[in-house]
Each structure stands twice: as structure tokens, then as C-alpha cells.
């Protein structure tokens, strides 16, 4: 299978992990499908819930993946950006804060560029409740870890804030920051930001990004 | 720094093929982004007309669908735009553009300087 | 597909004064619009993107606002060199479609 939507439609519907394989090619990667949400179908690519995973990992942990698909994990750079040049992906995003409310953002066109190209971020026609104006700067952005500084500020982002993520100088988001627990989790600059929904000093309490191919 | 060179006749019959290249230097056209054709009629009014995106697929305007075709050369860095079945109507200047998307339509960063085409007998 | 109505057609006005140029789209294209600046003799040159974002090197005199169905390109203070055609464009669906243009002249 090569993401979440050809696991169900072969008749897998029930969540759980799945081994997808990468487009033209026998390597393989385990991957959490969601068969339930919004018709199923979704690829899980990050996921963050309860601190358990460490984020602020190198260039090539953020390429091919780290963590436990089950829990916290990032699916992978390489596999993500082969698997969305291929045909067109829809990106969503969703966000759940520490006083019980969810809400998430929309991408109707999304795609890695390759890892010459710093895995890029391009996005398009956002919708949703998580803001009216996109938390990933757009145009899009390289792609930033600890050992890898790609962003648009002469600081380090990716030191600054932690985790690997797009930043731009630093920009709005990051997903893949700190996690901070209930009551640590204001004025915390560094931690799981969705600007445009929560604020710059509010870390998140649970984010998961997840992609389905746009004519699923 | 990206450039976008476009050329080709500048008087072309009608019933005829038109023919354009976009030379592109600063930035290979197999990397990323959409690569597109545009035309400006007399008046100024813009058309969108359609792109070739970095991984080889092609979008068209609806309203030239049957008549347009654009391709590629990635050895020369160009991509080509051809215009069949031409009339008046299509004289115009046409800008080749890079857009800032590869696999959709979007805002354009980088145009050429544009060629003018007249379709006359 | 989206009709962008762009107006008005004709500014004229003196240098240092404050000018704005609406788009209507006829359906929604979300933020998905760009401005664009036409000088005489040349090629259009991205202003303002996604509705808002000024891109690399453009004057902060430039400034973009809207979403859904309305936007509005403003010039705060204009300049002579400012002499061009000012076009929207959206770009939220397939085709992307053009204003009609606003001509700015200066007195």
C-alpha cells in the first residue's frame, strides 16, 4: 500500500498501524492510518499528545522518521515528499488545546519538495477553524532542524524554539516544539504553536497532521 | 537570480500554429514550481492560459483546452507553448511566468520580458 | 470559473496621496489573491500575495487586505514611480483569473 486511503479501500477500515511502501520502490515504513475521521482514509504523518517524544531531533531522524506511530511520531520527510509529488494530497491539521477545544485547518493542496530543495512546504486553499490565515508561513518554507538551519532569521529557529519544523523568521507555527502540561503551558515561547488559533505563548495540549489524496 | 526568456515569430498566419519558447536560466525547471504561459491582449487584459509543472503535468484554460499544448525540454532548461488553429483574436503579447506553486495554479514571482505575436494574413 | 471585478479603471491623483483599488470575486477565493504592478514597457511584477503578504523587496507603502470575496490593494503614499497598471489576481481555483486593471496616473 502506498499511504492510509489504498489501505481502506482495499477494506481495511479499522484504525490502527499499517506497513505502507514508498512510490517506486520496495522500502517500507509504518505509518497509523484513520479510518474513521472525515471518511477515513488519512495517513498520519505527526502526532503529539502527551510529551513521551522527544522532537528536537536531527535532519536525518525528521527524514526518516522517529517515535512510535501508536503515540508521538514523525512519520518522515523523504517518505512524505515522495508520496505527495506523486499525486496531489490534502493536508489537515488538528489541534486540541487544554480547555477542551479542538479545532483544525484545512490545506486542499499540499506537497514536500525534495530534500535538495530542504523539504519545502507548499500549501494552498486553507480552510477550517484553526484561523482564516494560514499559522505555516506561505509561501512556504525549508524545512529546519537542529543541525540543519534553513530559516530566514539570523537566529536558529530550530535551536530557538526546538524541534524541526518550516520556519520562516521564526514564523507563526510549530508543531513539533516543546510540549508543556496544563498550567505550564502559557508564555511558553517555545512551545506547540498554532499562532492564528491560540496565540504565540500558548502550547498546545495535542496536534496531529494528516494527509489523504485530494480525489479519495 | 531566476530569468525567464521568452521568443519566437513575431507574425503568424491565420489558421496557423503558434510557437513559443521559454529559455529559462538561474533555476532548473525539473526542481520545482509550475512554469506558465500568459497572454495581455490589446486593452491590457490578462489571460492565464496554462502551465507545465516541475514534475512534468500539464493544466490548461478550459477555454483554450483543445487548441493548446504545452511541453518541455529539461536538457535545455525550456518549456514551449503551441497555439493551434490561431485567428486575430489571439494576437497578443504572451509572458512566460514561474509560479510559486508546483502542482496548482497560483501567484506568479518571476515573468519574462514578453514577445509580441500578431496573427495577420 | 471566478470573475474578478477590479475598480475602478482609472486613478488620477497627486504624488503623496493615499489610493485604494478594490477586487470583488465572484465567488469566494479565500485569501488566494495576488497584486500585481504593470510599468509601462514591462512585464507585471508581484506586489502583494495571499491577499496580504508583501513580497521580497516591495515598499511597505504597499499593502494588501481581504478575504472571502473582497480585497483591497492600497498605496499609502503614492510616488511618481508608482505610474503603472495595478491588476488583482486570484489564484484559489483553476483557471486563474485577472481584474481588468486599474491605470494609475499621476497629475
Known amino acids: 500500500f502506498r499511504d492510509c486511503a489504498e489501505v481502506f479501500k482495499s477494506g481495511h477500515t479499522t484504525n490502527g498501524i499499517y506497513t505502507l511502501t514508498f512510490p517506486n520502490s520496495t522500502e517500507e515504513i509504518k505509518a497509523y492510518c484513520d479510518m474513521e475521521a472525515g471518511g477515513g482514509g488519512w495517513t498520519i504523518i505527526q502526532r503529539r499528545e502527551d510529551g513521551s517524544v522527544d522532537f528536537q531531533r536531527t535532519w536525518k531522524e525528521y527524514k526518516v522518521g522517529f517515535g512510535n506511530p501508536s503515540g508521538e511520531y514523525w512519520l518522515g520527510n523523504e517518505f512524505v515528499s515522495q508520496l505527495t509529488n506523486q499525486q496531489r494530497y490534502v493536508l489537515k491539521i488538528h489541534l486540541k488545546d487544554w480547555e477542551g477545544n479542538e479545532a483544525y485547518s484545512l490545506y486542499e493542496h499540499f506537497y514536500l519538495s525534495s530534500e535538495e530543495l530542504n523539504y519545502r512546504i507548499h500549501l494552498k486553499g486553507l480552510t477550517g477553524t484553526a484561523g482564516k490565515i494560514s499559522s505555516i508561513s506561505q509561501p512556504g518554507n525549508d524545512f529546519s532542524t537542529k543541525d540543519g538551519d534553513n530559516d530566514k532569521c539570523i537566529c536558529k529557529c530550530s535551536q530557538m524554539l526546538t524541534g524541526g519544523w518550516w520556519f520562516d523568521a521564526c514564523g507563526p507555527s510549530n508543531l513539533n516544539g516543546m510540549y508543556y502540561p496544563q498550567r505550564q503551558n502559557t508564555n511558553a515561547f517555545n512551545g506547540i504553536k498554532w499562532y492564528y488559533w491560540k496565540g504565540s505563548g500558548y502550547s498546545l495540549k495535542a496536534t496531529t497532521m494528516m494527509i489523504r489524496p485530494a480525489d479519495f | 537570480d531566476v530569468q525567464l526568456q521568452e521568443s519566437g515569430p513575431g507574425l503568424v498566419k491565420p489558421s496557423q500554429s503558434l510557437s513559443l519558447t521559454c529559455t529559462v536560466t538561474g533555476y532548473s525547471i525539473t526542481s520545482d514550481y509550475a512554469w506558465n504561459w500568459i497572454r495581455q491582449f490589446p486593452g491590457n487584459k490578462l489571460e492565464w492560459m496554462g502551465y507545465?509543472?516541475?514534475?512534468?503535468?500539464?493544466s490548461y484554460n478550459p477555454s483554450l483546452k483543445s487548441r493548446i499544448s504545452i511541453t518541455r525540454d529539461t536538457s535545455k532548461n525550456q518549456f514551449f507553448l503551441q497555439l493551434n488553429s490561431v485567428t486575430p483574436e489571439d494576437t497578443a503579447t504572451y509572458y512566460c511566468?514561474?509560479?510559486?506553486?508546483?502542482?496548482?495554479?497560483?501567484?506568479?514571482?518571476?515573468w519574462g520580458q514578453g514577445t509580441s505575436v500578431t496573427v495577420s494574413s | 470559473s471566478i470573475v474578478m471585478t477590479q475598480t475602478p479603471k482609472l486613478l488620477l491623483v497627486s504624488a503623496g496621496d493615499r489610493v485604494t483599488i478594490t477586487c470583488k470575486a465572484s465567488q469566494s477565493a479565500s485569501n488566494d489573491v495576488a497584486w500585481y504592478q504593470q510599468k509601462p514597457g514591462q512585464s507585471p511584477k508581484l506586489l502583494i500575495y495571499y491577499a496580504s503578504n508583501r513580497y521580497t523587496g516591495v515598499p511597505d507603502r504597499f499593502t494588501g487586505s481581504g478575504y472571502g470575496t473582497d480585497f483591497t490593494f492600497a498605496i499609502s503614499t503614492v510616488q511618481a514611480e508608482d505610474l503603472a497598471i495595478y491588476f488583482c489576481q486570484q489564484d484559489y481555483s483553476s483557471p486563474p483569473t485577472f481584474g481588468g486593471g486599474t491605470k494609475l496616473e499621476i497629475k
Open positions: 507545465i509543472s516541475y514534475s512534468g503535468s500539464t
Open positions: 511566468a514561474r509560479s510559486t506553486f508546483g502542482h496548482y495554479v497560483s501567484s506568479m514571482d518571476y
